[in-house]
Interface confidence: medium
């Protein structure tokens, strides 16, 4: 019985460049850290076959199944693929252990299957199998997390019922406003579903996994900031579990915090208190107020109260579906070609949604904003001045949203002919849409101010490129013309462009550009 | 004004289980830790643990946990301490004792004391 | 856990006299210290928390001091209703733990 070679077997991601697709076996350029397969002989089979671990590839995903031999000499291989044989060039690692790769690159349903390599050296023939399958990714959810409170214990728990199982991270934060973003140094993140520390400023839980990430922020009435200019409000659905938090400084311990919905205190079970002292020796009292399963009667106006500060109310609606509301309305803007702007959206949503801005096909990430008003926005700034139709679309579990934008830059016409043996066309894309004329140019005119008026066909808006209205106008040919320049001009408010025709036989025409400002 | 009312003495044989009450007024309940603080016979003060009477929580030193259960009543505003297991060690004045912070501890107002005697 | 020690263990002073006692904690507590006064067959009282920080109620002859890991409570003129057994507490970290205790006597 000969010795078995040495043999592992690996898998490497791939970071999508944008490679065509195919299977092949040179690299594409971006990989991660290899992942073990394991590579285990198969008991009870004829032959000697090694069994890889199954791998799971997500639809468009670009791996490569490697195969590390530590045998004498040289090997031969061949890769079997659904009853085709496919090349296999083995090469030498600098340990010199033999290496045979197969790379999948765009993985799609048509690669799926049993991947089998025959390899041959000097001392023995084994094969190796591989399993590739698709990971079912409808199967996959992402759920916002909620909050519950651990048995026994003064601390939160957030859960999100997610497949596959999420990373669940706490993102605190002790200061106000603007340094409470993600990447600020004032935000703490701690991977872990329990929270004790629950007298932080604002206090987010998040989940993360292949579908993304959410999060859910704590509600939190603070006694000692000024109220806001409108009522915060909360939205939930009916049979989602309320949290606020109420939270109180002061300079001893002698105060106390009650919360109210609609001018009656809440049920003992519906609250719990928490407190401490900082580290100027004032004392942070906080009060959660909780209702594990919300129904459509725990709506109304939730009180916390201080008996040394002024009271403060939150909205709590229950809704039985979640919503998107904002005007749906197409809106249109004309800019200067070097004029700062933001497309906006304002709308107010429950639950979070998550959006997309898009154009000319091409989808950019959509960041929003709470407003102070219970409002949230959205903005687009990265037109780069180019003219066209955006759109904005933004969706929850229960609703959808799109809203039509079109953005017209204000510069003066470009012209672009054609001409063929009936006719001769000019376009122009400048904005405002640009009026025509056109011009013959002879002995008797050699600066082409004879106007043509006979055979122009003009078109306000000829096509539509991604919402780019585009203006044409055509010079059917006639006798009086063959045979001269002519001139078309497109002018608008902020200037006038010319294109010179020579109407002649078919075939490529000279055309001469004129710029006139 | 602030009063915690314990229950009286207690004798009890080792392997027994004694429970403590201690009633409060004269301030939110709900808005205050409920510490335990025992001390033998001319020993010092020991503390046993906590409980957060608005939650319900409760956090007990690690030589007491699995014998002692801290509980409370938020209609009777009473909080209880029941240590099971008994030994003549535990023979001690058991005291309630307030405090308004779950996370530094100074105990502002404390019970008369409940004197438990474990004899056989 | 956090060892607190006191010293002296008891003392003997006489009315009108300036008492000083020491705590010492076995790592750095910062100023999470607090001073109690308990009388024979009484529960204790508070009189200092937060190292210097007087309970109200509490006469202004008592003070206390430090920060980190040693502790002073003083008592600036000495009372007849001042003997008594003085303890220190950390309030720093669970479990909250006291000292042994100091016992002020008559001379």
């Known amino acids: 019985n000969q010795d078995l070679p040495v043999i592992k077997c690996v898998l490497i991601n791939h970071k999508n460049n944008d490679s065509s697709v195919g299977k092949s076996s040179s690299y594409p350029m971006v990989s991660e850290s290899p992942e073990d397969l394991g590579c285990a002989l198969r008991p009870q089979s004829s032959g000697t076959v090694y069994e890889a671990a199954a791998v799971e590839v997500d639809v468009s995903a670009s791996i490569t199944l490697q195969v590390l031999v530590d045998a004498p000499g040289n090997i031969s291989c061949l890769w079997v693929f659904k009853h085709s044989s496919l090349n296999c060039q083995p090469h030498f690692d600098l340990q010199n252990r033999g290496v045979v790769s197969m790379v999948i690159l765009k993985m799609t349903e048509t690669q799926a299957g049993e991947y089998l390599l025959f390899i041959q050296s000097e001392a023995t023939n084994y094969t190796i199998l591989f399993t590739v399958s698709i990971r079912n990714t409808l199967l996959y959810t992402l759920r916002r997390p909620y909050f519950r409170k651990m048995e026994n214990q003064d601390a939160l728990v957030c859960i999100s019922e997610s497949v596959p199982e999420p990373i669940v991270e706490w993102v605190l934060c002790d200061s106000q406003g603007e340094s409470c973003k993600e990447e600020s140094p004032a935000v703490v993140k701690k991977e872990e579903k329990v929270l004790h520390e629950l007298f932080g400023t604002d206090i987010r839980c998040c989940a993360r996994n292949e579908l993304g990430r959410e999060c859910t922020r704590l509600f939190t009435i603070d006694l000692n900031q000024t109220p806001q200019t409108t009522l915060p409000q909360l939205f939930l659905k009916v049979g989602e579990p309320l949290w606020i938090r109420c939270k109180a400084v002061h300079v001893n311990h002698g105060f106390g915090l009650t919360w109210e919905l609609e001018n009656k205190a809440l049920e003992e079970g519906n609250y719990f208190e928490m407190s401490t002292y900082s580290t100027n020796r004032t004392m942070i009292r906080i009060l959660f107020a909780f209702v594990s399963s919300v129904a459509r009667n725990d709506t109304g106006y939730y009180t916390c109260s201080s008996s040394k500060h002024p009271s403060q109310s939150a909205l709590v609606t229950i809704v039985e579906k979640g919503f998107i509301n904002a005007t749906n309305s197409s809106e249109d803007y004309e800019i200067d070609q070097y004029e700062e702007f933001c497309f906006s959206v304002r709308f107010k949503a429950y639950p979070q949604i998550r959006c997309t801005w898009t154009f000319s096909r091409k989808s950019f990430p959509c960041e929003q904003k709470g407003l102070d008003n219970g409002y949230s926005i959205s903005k687009f700034c990265n037109h780069k001045h180019q003219p066209g139709e955006y759109i904005f679309h933004a969706e929850n579990d229960d609703a959808q949203f799109t809203k039509m934008f079109t953005l017209n830059i204000r510069r003066k016409p470009q012209v672009l002919a054609e001409a063929s043996a009936s006719q001769a066309s000019c376009f122009s894309d400048g904005y405002p849409l640009p009026s025509w004329t056109w011009k013959k140019c002879s002995d008797k005119s050699p600066n082409c101010t004879e106007e043509i008026t006979e055979g122009v066909w003009n078109r306000k808006a000829n096509r539509k490129v991604f919402g780019q209205w585009v203006s044409s106008s055509t010079l059917n040919m006639s006798e009086a013309i063959k045979g001269f320049l002519v001139k078309c001009c497109a002018y608008n408010s902020l200037g006038t462009s010319c294109e010179t025709i020579l109407l002649n036989s078919p075939g490529p025409f000279p055309f001469i550009q004129d710029n006139i400002s | 004004q602030v009063q915690l009312v314990q229950s009286g003495a207690e004798v009890k044989k080792p392997g027994a289980s004694v429970k403590v009450s201690c009633k409060a007024s004269?301030?939110?309940?709900?808005?205050?830790?409920m510490d335990w603080v025992r001390q033998a016979p001319g020993q010092g003060l020991e503390w046993m643990g906590r409980?957060?009477?608005?939650?319900?929580?409760?956090t007990y030193v690690q030589k007491f946990q699995g014998r002692v259960t801290m509980t409370r009543d938020t209609s009777t505003s009473t909080v209880y301490m029941e240590l099971s297991s008994l030994r003549s060690e535990d023979t001690a004045v058991y005291y309630c004792?307030?405090?308004?912070?779950?996370?530094?501890?100074?105990?502002?107002?404390w019970g008369q004391g409940t004197l438990v005697t474990v004899s056989s | 856990d956090i060892q607190m020690t006191q010293s002296p263990s008891s003392l003997s002073a006489s009315v009108g006299d300036r008492v000083t006692i020491t705590c010492r904690a076995s790592q750095s507590i910062s100023s999470y210290l607090n001073w109690y006064q308990q009388k024979p067959g009484k529960a204790p009282k508070l009189l200092i928390y937060?190292?210097?920080s007087l309970q109200s109620g509490v006469p202004s002859r008592f003070s206390g001091s430090g920060s980190g890991t040693d502790f002073t409570l003083t008592i600036s003129s000495l009372q007849p209703e001042d003997f008594a057994t003085y303890y220190c507490q950390q309030s720093y970290s669970t479990p909250w733990t006291f000292g042994q205790g100091t016992k002020v006597e008559i001379k």
């Open positions: 937060a190292a210097s």
């Open positions: 004792a307030r405090t308004p912070s779950g996370s530094y501890s100074d105990f502002d107002y």
């Open positions: 004269g301030y939110t309940f709900t808005s205050y830790y």
């Open positions: 409980i957060n009477p608005s939650s319900g929580s409760t």
